[in-house]
Interface confidence: medium
């Protein structure tokens, strides 16, 4: 009678994470009597996966659970596969005895696990930056296998080219991680822009995963200021407006100064939004020119998003006409809130 052979017909098996792997093994004879054991890896450090004779292996089932004794199929199924299960599995025949002794091993089956990458997480800089500055975005995805993966960056649908990507670890591993850093130049129109990191992997069946970052959380568009003077019906009053345009985010505080002295401070509330996502706001000051003998320097000072203040000044000429002299007050008006200061 020919000597028993242990046959593992599959050199390799590829299984998706979460699924069940079937590892096939047959013997050519029932002699010698003795159990089959399955191991992952070879040598003294090999890991016991299944022992026919004894032990509890909750994830392992035999393919033929309760079959006829003439059958010599020792195939097993391992449920709920994870990347940690990857490796070479050996079906080993033992000869019955006290103790059982190893008789013959199969050639081994390499189990490769396909694991999906995690949803990409995109993060931007910790502090806001202004247009024309270059900012870095990072994208991370973990837990995928095999190692081959494609990562692309987009800004508003346009592919970016200035990025650097690493896949770790470099050597063999049960699963891998990808880390990419992209450089993006900000423009004033980027409040509504999105940066997208797209990851394509064999496990995703052509449907890549995407992570996004809104540039609204990264950009700061500083305001432009314009101070203008309009006459009003009352000949001794002048309306001075400060147009605060194209700023983002909304957090803004405005202070009026008359000849360097604080006249009023207010916080932007009723703003108007532009198509590009930036905001406009206007504040005005009703100046009673008859209260002033000399020219007045009016300054609109704006502190935007905690940044150093920017300001714009306007020189108000005072003409000494008798009919314009009288009242000793300057009236200030912002919208419907009018108050006189004495």
């Amino acid at each position: 009678e020919e000597e028993l052979q242990v046959i593992q017909p599959d050199k390799s098996v590829l299984v998706a994470a979460g699924e069940t792997a079937t590892l096939r093994c047959t013997a050519t004879s029932l002699i010698p009597v003795g159990p089959i054991q399955w191991f992952r890896g070879a040598g003294p450090a090999r890991e016991l996966i299944y022992n026919q004779k004894e032990g509890h292996f909750p994830r392992v089932t035999t393919v033929s659970e309760s079959t006829k004794r003439e059958n010599m199929d020792f195939s097993i199924s391992i449920s709920n596969i994870t990347p940690a299960d990857a490796g070479t599995y050996y079906c080993v025949k033992f000869r019955k005895g006290s103790p059982d002794t190893e008789f013959k091993s199969g050639a081994g089956t390499e189990l490769s696990v396909r694991a999906k990458p995690s949803a990409p997480v995109v993060s931007g800089p910790a502090a806001r930056a202004t247009p024309q500055h270059t900012v870095s975005f990072t994208c991370e995805s973990h837990g995928f296998s095999p190692r081959d993966i494609t990562l692309k960056w987009f800004k508003n649908g346009n592919e970016l080219s200035d990025f650097q990507t690493n896949v770790d670890p470099v050597g063999e591993s049960v699963s891998y991680s990808i880390h990419s850093t992209a450089k993006v130049v900000l423009t004033r129109e980027d409040v509504h822009s999105q940066v997208i990191c797209e990851v394509a992997h064999v496990t995703l069946q052509g449907d890549p995963l995407r992570g996004t970052a809104n540039l609204s959380e990264t950009i700061r568009v500083p305001p432009t200021l314009e101070v203008t003077q309009q006459p009003v019906r009352a000949e001794n009053q002048v309306n001075v407006t400060c147009q605060v345009r194209k700023f983002y985010p909304q957090r803004l505080q405005l202070t009026w100064l008359e000849n360097g002295n604080v006249s009023r401070t207010e916080t932007a509330s009723t703003v108007t939004e532009n198509k590009d996502g930036t905001y406009n706001w206007m504040s005005w000051l009703l100046v009673n020119v008859s209260a002033h003998r000399d020219d007045v320097k009016l300054t609109c000072q704006v502190e935007h998003d905690g940044q150093p203040a920017v300001s714009k000044s306007h020189d108000l000429k005072v003409s000494a006409h008798p009919k314009e002299q009288g009242s000793n007050t300057a009236a200030e008006n912002t919208g419907s809130n009018e108050r006189n200061i004495y």
Epitope: T62, S64, E65, S66, T67, K68, R69, D73, F74
Partner: antibody
Framework: QVQLKESGPGLVQPSETLSLTCTVS????????LSWVRQPSGKGPEWMGR???????AYNSALKSRLSISRDTSKNQVFLKMNSLQTDDTGTYYC??????????????????WGPGTMVTVSS | QFTLTQPKSVSGALRSTITIPCERS????????VSWYQRHLGRPPINVIY?????PSEVSDRFSGSIDSSSNSASLTITNLQMDDEADYFC?????????FGGGTKLTVL
Amino acid sequence: QVQLKESGPGLVQPSETLSLTCTVSGFSLASYSLSWVRQPSGKGPEWMGRMYYDGDTAYNSALKSRLSISRDTSKNQVFLKMNSLQTDDTGTYYCTRDRSMFGTDYPHWYFDFWGPGTMVTVSS
Amino acid sequence: QFTLTQPKSVSGALRSTITIPCERSSGDIGDSYVSWYQRHLGRPPINVIYADDQRPSEVSDRFSGSIDSSSNSASLTITNLQMDDEADYFCQSYDSKIDIFGGGTKLTVL
């Protein structure tokens, strides 16, 4: 839990046919094989035959000519028919659940659950 | 086809150790596995050892099985003998496609 119960006539006339039924619960006949084992009074047990999980049968060659085992999986029942009974067929008849030693294709079977047995007397 | 021979009876004192042999008539005892069963009067048999030396989880560790190639026999050993161990014990093995039982041993606890 796993249970097996034999039923049938306690007394059979010589030369007649014995019909026994084994009703099981707690497992599926599609997954486990069942054997019939008898123990004549004052002797050791004797394996009679097996109904495999897939419907095939195997018989003890000494009894094969007069033994037939069948099943009805929908009723969870396995049947034994043995003809031409003689007085030395008297004894306790058990149905047993078979277990492959390692829960897989391996040539060692043992009997992990037994029914209480039914006493069969062959007498005129 | 071989036979399995057991002594008709064995006795042992309470809390002692006894061994029940099961001799194979022909062929090597190592060519097939041996199982052991216990049967109390009026109760169905239960499996106490399978595969020569494997014990089902619900069976007391006082029960152990072994094989001895020099005597071509298998043995069931019961330590710390209890009154409830008094029962019939029989061994079982197989040859080709047939299961073979020993004649059974009556254990008496003194």
